[in-house]
Amino acid sequence: SRGSCDSLCNCEEKDGTMLINCEAKGIKMVSEISVPPSRPFQLSLLNNGLTMLHTNDFSGLTNAISIHLGFNNIADIEIGAFNGLGLLKQLHINHNSLEILKEDTFHGLENLEFLQADNNFITVIEPSAFSKLNRLKVLILNDNAIESLPPNIFRFVPLTHLDLRGNQLQTLPYVGFLEHIGRILDLQLEDNKWACNCDLLQLKTWLENMPPQSIIGDVVCNSPPFFKGSILSRLKKESICPTPPVYEEHEDPSGSLHLAATSSINDSRMSTKTTSILKLPTKAPGLIPYITKPSTQLPGPYCPIPCNCKVLSPSGLLIHCQERNIESLSDLRPPPQNPRKLILAGNIIHSLMKSDLVEYFTLEMLHLGNNRIEVLEEGSFMNLTRLQKLYLNGNHLTKLSKGMFLGLHNLEYLYLEYNAIKEILPGTFNPMPKLKVLYLNNNLLQVLPPHIFSGVPLTKVNLKTNQFTHLPVSNILDDLDLLTQIDLEDNPWDCSCDLVGLQQWIQKLSKNTVTDDILCTSPGHLDKKELKALNSEILCPGLVNNPSMPTQTSYLMVTTPATTTNTADTILRSLTDAVPLS
């Protein structure tokens, strides 16, 4: 084979991963490539002569974690083309000649997290095309010719980013589509053929219920003629649909039905590390539409470069600095007057210093999600005494301490999901006496210190997808006396004596407080069994079932099996490296 590192392709190693560059080598068949066995690699076959992917084409490339097939002429993908790529996390097949995504097109890609298929000629997506992609978070389909999406196309797909710009879509129903994308953070819908009639009411209502931090592109009407060019969100429901049809209960477009899909705690809003990679050439994307068209554009001196600003009535500024390659808050000059909301998501901020936010004392919301923050100097938020919402999700934090959160007397919402947090020191949340909602999902937590929630009026806590094998009730969970929602799923729970207390605590909670089933990981015979359905005797043979039995309170480091994979860790590893932008 001529396609090895010492001949056709250029190879280099980076952080234990081989980067195999076979770009523009006139390769006509994947079989021309051979790669070093037994090590993870990223492969770029950008700009070659590939016209078809044949069954088992990639079967010898089992350690691939990223494959770039952009700018080829691939018009057909045979069933089983991706066999053997069970480790693949990213697939770029943009700028090819695909016209259809078939039921089995992506068979074998069960670990895929990122799929880029923009700028093809896709008209048809078959019903189960994505059904096996149970880890897919980012799907980029802009600039194709998709006229409709089959019902339930994303039923089993945990998408957070979906780009459908530049297609031929006329409507998106709630049932079968919107109901399945409740975790979405970034939904791009511009430049389609939207028919602004009664059928689109469900989409309008659903969009209105999206949280303010979600990024949603404008839906511009294409028909009927008198609405052509109008933005859906600015039209009154009555004008779109003068005589509302009768909906079945589960389709009621009033808005209430959407809450299940958009506000449950396990949706983990703004929680992935992928905002920055969406600077892909999806249309060669620029600024997010609603950011670039603020209702009141301020004159230069008041809005820091390189941001866009919007006046919030009665006073105060909304400052959008999303995805502007900002490395430090000191880059924002001149400092704004009376900032109310500051959105710095998707930048490249590495650290936050004490001096950075001194002038931002009027802030009520600060969004630092999806940056690269490793260092949070103690007292960085000291002046932010009015802050109510703080987003630190999708960063590189590893430890939380009390000093980090000093000054946040009015904070109610704290988003820390998708970091690499391994340790929370005692008293960390004490500076936030009004904290109601805490997202810690998708981190590396194994233990919590005693009394960590003491005196903190938390109503919603998300501890999903960490490394907990057990969690004491006494001095930890029993401090959560205002709790209305807790998410504990997707942890490597060890269903043994130490978990009896947790089981009993869960059983005492009202029905909807625990959002998802807690499944055992160990011991082996209880793997995937539901904790609440198990008899205490099974958990702890010989146990006298005494509700007052003490539960473990000691603050011990718990070792978990090395085989336990951590979603946050893998996402951080796979998605923070620069993604080829072509």
Epitope: F71, N72, S97, G166, P281, K283, A284, S582
Partner: antibody, heavy 120, light 107 residues
Framework: QVQLVQSGAEVKKPGASVKVSCTAS????????LHWVRQAPGQGLEWVGI????????VYAQKFQGRVTMTRDTSTNTVYMELSSLRSEDTAVYYC?????????????WGQGTLVTVSA | EIVLTQSPATLSLSPGERATLSCRAS??????LAWYQQKPGQTPRLLIY???NRATGVPARFSGSGSGTDFTLTISSLETEDFAVYYC?????????FGGGTKVEIK
């Protein structure tokens, strides 16, 4: 209004290199791909390659691979096309052209062209 | 690469006449074919894309048809400003390729 302004005419000797610039204005630079297309005197149009101003590897026609380099400077909204090892048959007008927003492979605006003459 | 062959190379017609230009592809390009007009000393201008869609600002006398490998650009009634060279371009495959051009000249 959308404008693509190219650098002036160049006369080069065979074997030399030439670097042509194309400065964009009137639209958000990062939102649109830019292509380079050339036209030899009295001849048809020939696609050279494409670059995404917001980043990533440029893509070149196989014919020019190894001789052409496209780069970008987002601070000045400028893209560059450098062609090396020039030969007489590279004498042509070189155009930069913007890819349409919803049809990257179509050209909706063109620069005025830069005549590159390769002559001993 | 996909080769586009235009015919005739030159078309001599009078104003008011109908012009029919042909473009043939060496393999199917579906409907992804565009037509450009270039006047002497000027840059090309997009007229038709995806075989039959008129670009913004293009007069209704220009129309396109065809799919697969055979395409036609029709100018229903030639105006003096229509005398120019016309190129077809396919966008199905990389590299993007153009036809050799058809010159429409005044008879």
């Amino acid at each position: 209004q959308v404008q693509l302004v190219q650098s002036g005419a160049e006369v080069k000797k065979p074997g030399a290199s030439v670097k042509v610039s194309c400065t964009a204005s009137g639209y958000i630079f990062n939102d649109y791909y830019l292509h380079w297309v050339r036209q030899a005197p009295g001849q048809g149009l020939e696609w050279v390659g494409i670059i995404n101003p917001s980043g990533g590897s440029p893509v070149y026609a196989q014919k020019f691979q190894g001789r052409v380099t496209m780069t970008r400077d987002t601070s000045t909204n400028t893209v560059y096309m450098e062609l090396s090892s020039l030969r007489s048959e590279d004498t042509a007008v070189y155009y930069c052209a913007r890819g349409m927003v919803r049809g990257v492979r179509l050209f909706d605006y063109w620069g005025q062209g830069t005549l590159v003459t390769v002559s001993a | 690469e996909i080769v586009l062959t235009q015919s005739p190379a030159t078309l001599s017609l009078s104003p008011g006449e109908r012009a029919t230009l042909s473009c043939r592809a060496s393999q199917s390009v579906s409907s992804y074919l565009a037509w450009y007009q270039q006047k002497p000393g000027q840059t090309p201008r997009l007229l038709i894309y995806d075989a039959s869609n008129r670009a913004t600002g293009v007069p209704a006398r220009f129309s396109g048809s065809g799919s697969g490998t055979d395409f036609t650009l029709t100018i229903s009634s030639l105006e003096t400003e229509d005398f120019a060279v016309y190129y077809c371009q396919q966008r199905t495959n990389w590299p993007l390729t153009f036809g050799g051009g058809t010159k429409v000249e005044i008879k």
